[in-house]
Structures are given as structure tokens and as C-alpha cells.
């Protein structure tokens, strides 16, 4: 048969052009991209390829070795001078490894027919590629018409005698894809119809989107879809110590590229992202939530000696409310208010102070007023009770002043102004307050209520009474007003420093009306209610003392 060089050579010997070709080709062959998985690469098969040529005198394998003495499987055919060529080369069974779309990359050289004298009528410059799907690894003895044509392969670059002389070989690379595949594997076939071809390498591969970590989610190796425009949705799984609100997904394109990420993983509380992994927060650092990017130092007055802390512990005497965020400093109760002053106006007291020197690190400082009524003799104090009114209020005061009204007159009071904040109730420590002692002004006394009759005679009535319930000061004297019943316009007034009097010069057997009031430095109180007593008749004995209702 005609050799590719256009002259005859000994059978089964590689012609010169093959040697030249292989040396040039080997420099460009081996590495393939990470998103391509080879199902067959004729360059890497060490032993027999197991391919079959028919007829036997068609395609022939040229046995060559590379610089490492590894075999190079090259098939050539050059029956350009003969009519009706139909030379087939069948590969062994190729597993598709679950891929539904595969790619075939051919590297070959093709002789320019114009450079072959006398072969113009029979010489071709193309060859055909076919495939046949099969689950059977031994199903190669099939008919030609069962093969499905993939394409007619033509060379972009053909070579001439001149190229051979210059030792320049023009290696063509053609890639075709096949799909969708439905069986476990397939056979490829190459049909020569009269060309001068050297098939240097056949690489069959599928494309995958290679496993990747994106946004802390691991996406596995994913074989691309059968359709060239198809995007496969792939779920990712979160890396160790990470969580997600929205499950991470990506789309694997037919070209083996990851596209359109959806969702992401976040390092869980106590962990932060570093170099695509979730690293533990070290002692002194914390992360309260997955939504926070990185571990932060413990806020002031807090610490953690743990790894993976989600919050920090407050130092001794410092506290954190449940509503305080973990990023907030631990705080403590405020110190006492300062420079408290009072202003007494009769039975009202106005208190004023300045805020504590130490607010405890909080802005929510307020004030509480405790009121105590003190007995100046016994030195005993008791709660003031509900009759006292506080303006604007007794607790939760935001301003540094308050007015107490409806106090008792001429009474010793102690007011404790306590500063409180959001953590005061968490602290077992002593209350922080400033005390103010005040005495209310004297006021007119309350009415006398309890009057007892003493000795009653025909011309005189003796009375006694108790000090008013609320003297509101020091009682200087009492004023007793009396008149004969129904003669109110003609009354007599007696003044007494004591709580007893005797009214004399009265008419026998007559009813007299008595009213008593007390006086302090602030003035007279109101008169008591009316008390009626009757003098005895002329001849009667004087009566015993008894209480008038």
C-alpha cells in the first residue's frame, strides 16, 4: 500500500512522518483540565489497546515508544490510490461511568490530496466517526449499520510533501460530543473511505464540575448533564462547625463550571471563618451568632477561658441583664447620688441631688425615694405609709428632683434617695443611697376630739380633753368657747395652757355648748365639734365625771 510519505515502505514499519509527528505531538499531549474525567486516553494505555481493524489490511497500528520507552498507540491508513475504501477501526468497550454526555478528542494528521500525484480521483480528506451503545463489554461483533454516525471529521491543517521535507507536522485536534447516553458503555468506530490519516491519540472524557468549597459549603464532584444548555442544581453540605438558614445550592453547567450560587453556610456561634473552614474562637474571644462574621474580644468587664465561647462571663461584681446583648460590657449598680439638698415648705419637701459619680457603665440610671418617719425621742423609724404623695413619682425617677406632699407637720423624716440601674436587682451588694433628714414645719393642729366632763355643779362645769391626734407642732394653748344653748351670739372664751378648765358663773339647770381648739406657732386649729353639758338644779348634788359621746 501507498505510505503516507507517498512512497512504499516495508510492512509494519513506521514511516518517517510518523516519527516526526510523534515527537512534535508528545510535547503537547498529556495534561487535561480538572473538570474533565478521561474514560479513555490512548496515550496513557501501557499495553495493547485491544482495538480491532477490519478489513485487516486497512487501519494499522504503528508501534512506537516515547522518550520513557512507553508505547505510543498510533493508527494509520493511507489507501488513497484504491477505489471504494471502507476501512473500520473499532475501539474496545468504553464505560461511561454514569455520564450521559461524553466528548471525543481526536488528534490526527491528514495528507493533502493535492500533494498526491495520481490519487486525485480516489483520495479523500475526511473520515467518519461512529458510536454504538452497549451494556455488554463483549458486543463488538455488530453490523456497520448499527453504528450511529457522530460526524465527518475533516482536517483544519493538511500536510504536503514539502512539509515532510521541512520536518514540520501539522497536528489537528477535533472534539465532538455525544449524548444523551443511556447504557453503561459504548464503542467508538473510525471509518476511512480513502484518506491518508494518522490517528495519533483518542481521548474520550466527560465533563464534571469538580468538588469545591464555596461559602463554607462543600459541593461534590458532579457529572454534567446530557444537554449542552442544561444546568444541574446541586445541593452543598456545610463544612464542620457551620450552619445555614438557606440550604446552599449551585448549578453545574454543561461545560463543568459552577454557576449561580444560592444560599450559604455560616460558621456557627463560637466559630469563625478562616481559610474556608470554621475555626474555634480562642479564649478571650466569642461569637454569639452564626450571622456575625468573626470572633470578637470579650466586652469590658467580662472574660472567657473557654474555646468556642458564644458569650463571655462577667467579672466579679459586674452583671449582665438577660436583655443586654452579649456584645455589651458587663455593668454594675451605680454609686449613691450626691449632694442631696432639701427644701421644706410646711408639709411638703422638695429634694434635689446630682447623679452618681459612677453610673456602673449603664445609661438606664433611675432613682427611688424611700420615706421613713422617725420618732425623735425613741430614734425609731417606720415606713411613711400610703398617705404621702410623690411628684412626679416615687420610683423610676429620671430627673434628679422630687416633691413629697401630704407629709405630717412638725415630723422628723428621713428620705433615702437610691440610684438604681438595669443590674441593681442582680447585685447582692448593699443599696447605694444618700440620706436626707428633714423636719416638716409646724401647722395648725387638728381638732380636739376627745372631751370628758368633770365635776358639774349648779353654777360651774369642769372639762378635760386629750391633745389633738395631730398637734402639728408644740401646743401653746387651748381656746375654749362656750355659750348657753340657742344663745350662740353671746359666747364666752377661756384660754388654757392645760387640758382642763372649769367654766364658772353659769346658770343652774341650763344646757351649755362647748367647743375647743388648740394653737401652735402656726396658728389655731379649727374648733372641735359641739359638746353639750347641763348644770345641776339649785338643790341637786354635783355629778360624777363621765365621758361625753
Amino acid at each position: 500500500p501507498a505510505s503516507l510519505a507517498g512512497c512504499y515502505s516495508a510492512p509494519r514499519r513506521a514511516p518517517l512522518w510518523t516519527c516526526l509527528l510523534l515527537c512534535a505531538a508528545l510535547r503537547t499531549l498529556l495534561a487535561s483540565p480538572s473538570n474533565e474525567v478521561n474514560l479513555l486516553d490512548s496515550r496513557t494505555v501501557m499495553g495493547d489497546l485491544g482495538w480491532i481493524a477490519f478489513p485487516k489490511n486497512g487501519w494499522e497500528e504503528i508501534g512506537e515508544v516515547d522518550e520513557n520507552y512507553a508505547p505510543i498507540h498510533t493508527y494509520q491508513v493511507c489507501k488513497v490510490m484504491e477505489q471504494n475504501q471502507n476501512n473500520w477501526l473499532l475501539t474496545s468497550w468504553i464505560s461511561n461511568e454514569g455520564a450521559s454526555r461524553i466528548f471525543i478528542e481526536l488528534k490526527f494528521t491528514l495528507r493533502d490530496c493535492n500533494s498526491l500525484p495520481g490519487g486525485l480521483g480516489t483520495c479523500k480528506e475526511t473520515f467518519n466517526m461512529y458510536y454504538f451503545e452497549s451494556d455488554d463489554q463483549n458486543g463488538r461483533n455488530i453490523k456497520e449499520n448499527q453504528y450511529i454516525k457522530i460526524d465527518t471529521i475533516a482536517a483544519d491543517e493538511s500536510f504536503t510533501e514539502l512539509d515532510l521535507g521541512d520536518r514540520v507536522m501539522k497536528l489537528n485536534t477535533e472534539v465532538r460530543d455525544v449524548g444523551p447516553l443511556s447504557k453503561k458503555g459504548f464503542y467508538l468506530a473510525f471509518q476511512d473511505v480513502g484518506a491518508c490519516i494518522a490517528l495519533v491519540s483518542v481521548r474520550v472524557y466527560y465533563k464534571k464540575c469538580p468538588s469545591v468549597v464555596r461559602h463554607l459549603a462543600v459541593f461534590p464532584d458532579t457529572i454534567t448533564g446530557a444537554d449542552s444548555s442544561q444546568l444541574l442544581e446541586v445541593s452543598g453540605s456545610c463544612v464542620n462547625h457551620s450552619v445555614t438558614d438557606e440550604p446552599p445550592k449551585m448549578h453545574c453547567s454543561a461545560e463543568g463550571e459552577w454557576l449561580v450560587p444560592i444560599g450559604k453556610c455560616m460558621c456557627k456561634a463560637g466559630y469563625e471563618e478562616k481559610n474556608g473552614t470554621c475555626q474555634v474562637c480562642r479564649p478571650g474571644f466569642f461569637k454569639a451568632s452564626p450571622h456575625i462574621q468573626s470572633c470578637g474580644k470579650c466586652p469590658p468587664h467580662s472574660y472567657t477561658h473557654e474555646e468556642a465561647s458564644t458569650s463571655c462571663v462577667c467579672e466579679k461584681d459586674y452583671f449582665r441583664r438577660e436583655s443586654d446583648p452579649p456584645t455589651m460590657a458587663c455593668t454594675r449598680p451605680p454609686s449613691a447620688p450626691r449632694n442631696a439638698i432639701s427644701n421644706v415648705n410646711e408639709t411638703s419637701v422638695f429634694l434635689e441631688w446630682i447623679p452618681p459619680a459612677d453610673t456602673g457603665g449603664r445609661k438606664d440610671v433611675s432613682y427611688y425615694i424611700a420615706c421613713k418617719k422617725c420618732n425623735s425621742h425613741a430614734g425609731v423609724c417606720e415606713e411613711c405609709g400610703g398617705h404621702v404623695r410623690y411628684l412626679p413619682r416615687q420610683s423610676g425617677l429620671k430627673n434628679t428632683s422630687v416633691m413629697m406632699v401630704d407629709l405630717l407637720a412638725h415630723t422628723n423624716y428621713t428620705f433615702e434617695i437610691e440610684a438604681v440601674n438595669g443590674v441593681s436587682d442582680l447585685s447582692p451588694g448593699a443599696r447605694q443611697y444618700v440620706s436626707v433628714n428633714v423636719t416638716t414645719n409646724q401647722a395648725a393642729p387638728s381638732p380636739v376630739t376627745n372631751v370628758k366632763k368633770g365635776k358639774i355643779a349648779k353654777n360651774s362645769i369642769s372639762l378635760s380633753w386629750q391633745e389633738p391626734d395631730r398637734p402639728n407642732g408644740i401646743i401653746l394653748e387651748y381656746e375654749i368657747k362656750y355659750f348657753e344653748k340657742d344663745q350662740e351670739t353671746s359666747y364666752t372664751i377661756i384660754k388654757s395652757k392645760e387640758t382642763t378648765i372649769t367654766a364658772e358663773g353659769l346658770k343652774p339647770a341650763s344646757v351649755y355648748v362647748f367647743q375647743i381648739r388648740a394653737r401652735t406657732a402656726a396658728g389655731y386649729g379649727v374648733f372641735s365639734r359641739r359638746f353639750e353639758f347641763e348644770t345641776t338644779p339649785v338643790f341637786a348634788a354635783s355629778s360624777d365625771q363621765s365621758q361625753i359621746p
Epitope: 470579650c298 472574660y303 477561658h305 474555646e307 462571663v313 467579672e315 466579679k316
Partner: antibody, heavy 120, light 111 residues
Framework: EVQLVESGGGLVQPGGSLKLSCAAS????????IHWVRQAPGKGLEWVAS????????YYADSVKGRFTISRDNSKNTLYLQMNSLRAEDTAVYYC?????????????WGQGTLVTVSS | DIVMTQSPGSLAVSLGERATINCKAS??????????MNWYQQKPGKAPKLLIY???NLESGIPDRFSGSGSGTDFTLTISRLEEEDAASYYC?????????FGQGTKLEIK
């Protein structure tokens, strides 16, 4: 007042075992990391082991790894150091020390130490 | 392990004078802008006492004549005006990385 008191030291033969204790008071023991540090006679300080408050993080010096075990009982406010396969070079005063609260933390309170002598 | 090397091994300084002790770490003891370097004082028969934490922070109750400086691998403890009670051994310690290694110590004597 913060106090750390070590106990359990004494004379032990090479290959023997000893368990040291460190009783803590005056602070919230369960939230503090505690360390053991030792000092051979006439020598410098050597860090031995540490344990976090919740016992989640434990570290050892290479020289004691596999032989010593640090542990704590927060209900008893006590730290322990179980020492097995003792060697002559383990002879030292053993101190327990509290990890501080001011960042970055140092060892702010130390016990008075307990002497361990390994000798035949 | 991080190796801490102190210098000098011992020094004698007059009362009222400045004393300086150096500590060099075999690798950086910094993390996130802080230096994990502590200094301790130890007197014979006593437990060590924390003087400086975080390279330059004075521990509560320590006189302000003690100060610390440095970052990365090189650190210094300075006693500005030496007093009688400062005669002791001084140790640096890194707490950036387990194990928490100490320097070999520097013995300070009063001249």
C-alpha cells in the same frame, strides 16, 4: 478573697503515682481556667497543664503528656493533677494558678505550692 | 513550641537605678493586635506574682515603677527606680499558644 491551696505532694518512688489537689475559694471557680506550673529545685518555672472552666479545653506540656491528667470538680471547687509513671525529673514544687480576667490573660493568683519528690 | 529566651541571666543594679530585662520569643506571640506576653516576679520560697499582662498592662496592685513594652517577638520589662523589695527572679511567659512556655528567668540583685 481569692485563695488557691495545693495539697497532696510528698515523696514517691520512680514509676509511682501521686494525685495533687488545689482547693479554690473567693471566686466563681467554674468559670475560670486553672493551670499547673512547676519549679524544680533551683530551676525556673515550667508550665505543666491547663484546663478550662467547663473542662472542654485541656492542654499538657510535652514532657508530661500521656503520664499526667488534669481534671476538676466544680461542685467541690477543686482542681486535680493525677501524676503517673513519675520520674526523677518530675521532682518540683507544683503550683496551681488561676487564669486572669483582664485580657490578654495572665496567671493572676497562685497557690503557695506543694513539693513532689520522686526518689528511690 | 515557642521558646522564650531571657537576657541577661542575672544582673545587679543600684537602688534608684533603672533595671531592664529582655525576652525574645522564637516566633511571634501576637494575635489580633495583642501581645500575649506576661511578666512574673518570684521571691525565694514564694509563689510567682503577675506583674504585667499583655506585654504592657500593669496588673492591679503593682507599683507603677514596673512597665512592659514590645510586640511580636521582642519584649522588655523595665523597673524605673529600683527598690530593695525588687530583688527577685523575673520570668516572661507567652500565652499565645499551647504550651504556655516561660523564659528561663533573670535574677535581679541590688548592687
Amino acid at each position: 478573697e481569692v485563695q488557691l491551696v495545693e495539697s497532696g505532694g510528698g515523696l514517691v518512688q520512680p514509676g509511682g503515682s501521686l494525685k495533687l489537689s488545689c482547693a479554690a475559694s473567693g471566686f466563681t471557680f467554674s468559670t475560670f481556667g486553672i493551670h499547673w506550673v512547676r519549679q524544680a529545685p533551683g530551676k525556673g518555672l515550667e508550665w505543666v497543664a491547663s484546663i478550662s472552666g467547663a473542662s472542654t479545653t485541656i492542654y499538657y506540656a510535652d514532657s508530661v503528656k500521656g503520664r499526667f491528667t488534669i481534671s476538676r470538680d466544680n461542685s467541690k471547687n477543686t482542681l486535680y493533677l493525677q501524676m503517673n509513671s513519675l520520674r526523677a525529673e518530675d521532682t518540683a514544687v507544683y503550683y496551681c494558678a488561676r487564669y486572669g480576667t483582664s485580657f490578654p490573660y495572665g496567671l493572676d493568683y497562685w497557690g503557695q505550692g506543694t513539693l513532689v519528690t520522686v526518689s528511690s | 513550641d515557642i521558646v522564650m529566651t531571657q537576657s541577661p541571666g542575672s544582673l545587679a543594679v543600684s537602688l534608684g537605678e533603672r533595671a531592664t530585662i529582655n525576652c525574645k520569643a522564637s516566633q511571634s506571640v501576637d494575635y489580633d493586635g495583642d501581645s500575649y506576653m506576661n511578666w512574673y516576679q518570684q521571691k525565694p520560697g514564694k509563689a510567682p506574682k503577675l506583674l504585667i499582662y499583655g506585654a504592657s498592662n500593669l496588673e492591679s496592685g503593682i507599683p507603677d515603677r514596673f512597665s512592659g513594652s514590645g510586640s511580636g517577638t521582642d519584649f522588655t520589662l523595665t523597673i524605673s527606680r529600683l527598690e530593695e523589695e525588687d530583688a527577685a527572679s523575673y520570668y516572661c511567659q507567652q500565652s499565645n499558644e499551647d504550651p504556655f512556655t516561660f523564659g528561663q528567668g533573670t535574677k535581679l540583685e541590688i548592687k
